[in-house]
Interface confidence: low
């Protein structure tokens, strides 16, 4: 069964996929599609690459933000909605008959749980779950604890998701390591 990845409505979803170019720099075409990987190509293509760059995106919300030239073709879907839920196929189109690598991943989009804690609890909650702020779309994660919040949007899963993805990505980016999350 597919590995599940959870994202909240309005947040960015990250679906990992990677390969090792052999020899290094010898990139191969990749497609991402909505729906399980079919026999050939991708169904309902959302993004496609060639040997040089992304050459087909059905929406500006779909991005490859990884180290593309090292084979990190993980898909980022910006500002997800409930309609983005479902199985996605990452197909690495290695030349030759039936050589393709196929990876099915499942995206589960959930509504954010809005919690309005009692005032006495508020400070403890914001300290325990500081909001994750990022510089740019995928810049270094900074942790900030807001001072006084009359209404705390406590998105615990989002906090851990962003903490895991952004810090891991930034730590490994320049090392050239392949980023895999489960």
């Amino acid at each position: 069964s597919e590995v599940e990845y959870i994202a909240e409505v309005g947040q960015n979803a990250y679906l990992p996929c990677s390969y090792t170019p052999a020899p290094p720099g010898n990139l191969v075409p990749v497609c991402w599609g909505k729906g399980a990987c079919p026999v050939f190509d991708c169904s309902n293509v959302v993004l496609r690459t060639d040997n040089r760059d992304v050459n087909d995106r059905t929406s500006g919300r779909y991005w490859l933000k990884g180290d593309f030239h090292k084979g990190d073709v993980s898909l980022t879907i910006e500002n997800v909605t409930l309609a983005d839920s479902g199985v996605y196929c990452c197909r690495i189109q290695i030349p030759g008959i039936m050589n393709d690598e196929k990876h099915n991943v499942k995206l589960v989009v959930i509504k954010p749980a809005k919690v309005t804690p009692a005032p006495t609890l508020q400070r403890d909650l914001t300290s325990a779950f500081p909001r994750m702020l990022t510089t740019g779309e995928h810049g270094p994660a900074e942790t900030q604890t807001p001072g006084s919040l009359p209404d705390v949007n406590l998105t615990v899963s989002n906090f851990f998701c962003e903490l895991q993805i952004f810090t891991l990505t930034n730590e490994l980016r320049d090392s050239g390591a392949t980023i895999r999350t489960a």
């Epitope: 020899p23 290094p24 720099g25 010898n26 990139l27 040997n51 040089r52 760059d53 992304v54 991005w63 490859l64 933000k65 180290d67 593309f68 030239h69 510089t135 740019g136 779309e137 995928h138 810049g139 270094p140």
Partner: antibody, heavy 121, light 107 residues
Framework: EVQLVESGGGLVQPGGSLRLSCAAS????????IHWVRQAPGKGLEWVAD????????EYADSVKDRFTISADTSKNTAYLQMNSLRAEDTAVYYC??????????????WGQGTLVTVSS | DIQMTQSPSSLSASVGDRVTITCRAS??????VAWYQQKPGKAPKLLIY???FLYSGVPSRFSGSRSGTDFTLTISSLQPEDFATYYC?????????FGQGTKVEIK
């Protein structure tokens, strides 16, 4: 150590030709993009062309399209810029620089020392 | 083509000053912006890539940030070796384009 060394610059008459070379060492150009960037005297930086030797993709600025040709020889680890029909406005220091295959990461982390091209009669 | 409007074109500052240079893209470039430093007669050097990432070996007094299509290079405490010309560049679409440069001079 990563190094880029340009050569081939000089004085040429309008309408003439020059071939610039960019010899790379310390890395395999087939894994990267190689860019040519120029700088006219006292002016800013202008991108000219790029090539991804591993994939064979080439791109050009409109100002040089159909006049300049970028190429690479991976066996020599060298990129070239063939400049034809040169004009006075092509006078500049020409730098080669190393970039990356995917444009989202394609900043230029290593640059050559530059070679001066002067187009004048 | 995407225009990168850089400001100011020049500035005078003293050692220890905090210096801010801005670049505005004429359309969305995501985080595909780099900053370079160039000294007279020398090739440019990469300082910041992907809008906010400090390039290896660059002093931590340099930082970059993004707000929409506005990009900022900040030098927190100007040092004597920082007097140079600085360029922003977008590499989101072809052709890659540079800002016109900001010359940082000694006051």
């Amino acid at each position: 150590e990563v190094q880029l060394v340009e050569s081939g610059g000089g004085l040429v008459q309008p309408g003439g030709s020059l071939r610039l070379s960019c010899a790379a060492s310390g890395f395999n150009i087939g894994n990267y993009a190689i860019h040519w960037v120029r700088q006219a005297p006292g002016k800013g930086l202008e991108w000219v062309a790029d090539i991804t030797p591993g994939q064979g993709y080439t791109e050009y600025a409109d100002s040089v399209k159909d006049r300049f040709t970028i190429s690479a020889d991976t066996s020599k680890n060298t990129a070239y810029l063939q400049m034809n029909s040169l004009r006075a406005e092509d006078t500049a220091v020409y730098y080669c620089a190393r970039g990356y295959v995917y444009r989202m990461w394609d900043s230029y982390d290593y640059w050559g020392q530059g070679t001066l091209v002067t187009v004048s009669s | 083509d995407i225009q990168m409007t850089q400001s100011p074109s020049s500035l005078s500052a003293s050692v220890g000053d905090r210096v801010t240079i801005t670049c505005r893209a004429s359309q969305d470039v995501n985080t595909a912006v780099a900053w370079y430093q160039q000294k007279p007669g020398k090739a440019p050097k990469l300082l910041i890539y992907s809008a906010s990432f400090l390039y290896s070996g660059v002093p931590s007094r340099f930082s970059g940030s993004r707000s929409g299509t506005d990009f900022t290079l900040t030098i927190s405490s100007l040092q004597p070796e920082d007097f140079a010309t600085y360029y922003c560049q977008q590499h989101y679409t072809t052709p890659p384009t540079f800002g016109q440069g900001t010359k940082v001079e000694i006051k």
